[in-house]
Interface confidence: medium
Amino acid sequence: LPAQVAFTPYAPEPGSTCRLREYYDQTAQMCCSKCSPGQHAKVFCTKTSDTVCDSCEDSTYTQLWNWVPECLSCGSRCSSDQVETQACTREQNRICTCRPGWYCALSKQEGCRLCAPLRKCRPGFGVARPGTETSDVVCKPCAPGTFSNTTSSTDICRPHQICNVVAIPGNASMDAVCTSTSPTRSMAPGAVHLPQPVSTRSQHTQPTPEPSTAPSTSFLLPMGPSPPAEGSTGD
């Protein structure tokens, strides 16, 4: 005989667990329905009635199947200098990220409390390690035979062009100057850029049944002038 499909609420067999999208209610001692993302449990189940779900109110959300009594609050509004990369909906938290060219320098579970501008490597220095969402650019002096003539958070040191006859030798902050009309080998025109950091932050999720304790909202703090670091500029 085919197994009967049990409808919630139902008492589970001893030693068995409730099915997907169901939870075991300790009070009713029954398997009951979870609420879908964007909803929460308005009335918990009993032995004779299933969970009653209701939609999340404005500015609140649930991202997973759940049986939480109230939806989670979306994180604080993004500040004026931030980018809202994900809006607050009934099914997802708001995500704010530091604007391009900035990184998160001070954070708590709630998100980024301090966005700071990425360090710019000054002429004679190139990017050794690009900035990420949570780390600053690392600059390094251009090695012999390479140069950087820009103040940039993305440019690396580039090789000097090789001349048939050198008019002015290159140094760490200037390319070589050739006397002939064209060098034997040169880099493509324009600076070599490292890509800007791409957000890799994934949305925090809330475990079931407990609400998430880590909304992934970032926050921006207006910056004062940064003191220039070695090989970098605060400009």
Epitope: L72, S76, A105, L106, A116, L221, S226
Partner: antibody, heavy 120, light 111 residues
Framework: QVQLVQSGAEVKKPGASVKVSCKAS????????IDWVRQATGQGLEWIGE????????YYNEKFKGRATLTANKSISTAYMELSSLRSEDTAVYFC?????????????WGQGTLVTVSS | DIVMTQSPDSLAVSLGERATINCRAS??????????MHWYQQKPGQPPKLLIY???NLESGVPDRFSGSGAGTDFTLTISSLQAEDVAVYYC?????????FGQGTKVEIK
């Protein structure tokens, strides 16, 4: 305008617990932290911890971990600080304060304070 | 924990004169060009009141005779021309890392 109104004075016996409330108004309660600070008579300020009401996340001074419990009720915009296993040295005025998540990152509005006296 | 040490413990200044309070942190309270150091004023029977945030920013409604300066571990609160209503205890506080910590306070009186 931002206002934090705390519950009234309490007298407790050693070993008991006390729960102080802090009702917020004039801003979005779930957007900012509520910090708790205490001050013994004639003494300086001591940070107990903070709660982010939007998520319930808490951060405690290690000195108070296990004895202090910070909670918040979003529906009535009220934060609570419960201190257990009270001893005479816990006699102090307890303040709640708002700290913005971004911007100042300082406690810019304070409650009026709640005097907790621990005496046998 | 970051330990905050204020000096002096008390200060008597004539009306209209300059008052200077120092605060030293046991380690830097700076991060990416911002100093997470704040100054509060507390009068008897009242809660503390924020005067200066992030080392040098004047809180809204605070008279401009109050100013803050410093970076790293050493900070100063200055009252350019002391008024009678400035008699109070002043505290520095860091919020760079948990636990947030306060200085022991400096009592300012009229000479």
């Amino acid at each position: 305008q931002v206002q934090l109104v705390q519950s009234g004075a309490e007298v407790k016996k050693p070993g008991a617990s006390v729960k102080v409330s802090c009702k917020a108004s004039g801003y979005t309660f779930t957007d900012d932290y509520i910090d708790w600070v205490r001050q013994a008579t004639g003494q300086g300020l001591e940070w107990i911890g903070e709660i982010y009401p939007g998520s319930g996340n808490t951060y405690y001074n290690e000195k108070f971990k296990g004895r202090a419990t910070l909670t918040a009720n979003k529906s009535i915009s009220t934060a609570y600080m419960e201190l257990s296993s009270l001893r005479s040295e816990d006699t102090a005025v307890y303040f709640c304060a708002r700290s913005q998540v971004y911007g100042k990152i300082a406690m810019d509005h304070w409650g009026q304070g709640t005097l907790v006296t621990v005496s046998s | 924990d970051i330990v905050m040490t204020q000096s002096p413990d008390s200060l008597a200044v004539s009306l209209g004169e300059r008052a200077t309070i120092n605060c030293r942190a046991s380690e830097s309270v700076d991060n990416s060009g911002n100093s997470f150091m704040h100054w509060y004023q507390q009068k008897p029977g009242q809660p503390p009141k924020l005067l200066i945030y992030r080392a040098s920013n004047l809180e809204s409604g605070v008279p401009d005779r109050f100013s803050g300066s410093g970076a790293g571990t050493d900070f100063t609160l200055t009252i350019s021309s002391l008024q009678a209503e400035d008699v109070a205890v002043y505290y520095c506080q860091q919020s760079k890392e948990d636990p947030y910590t306060f200085g022991q306070g400096t009592k300012v009186e009229i000479k």
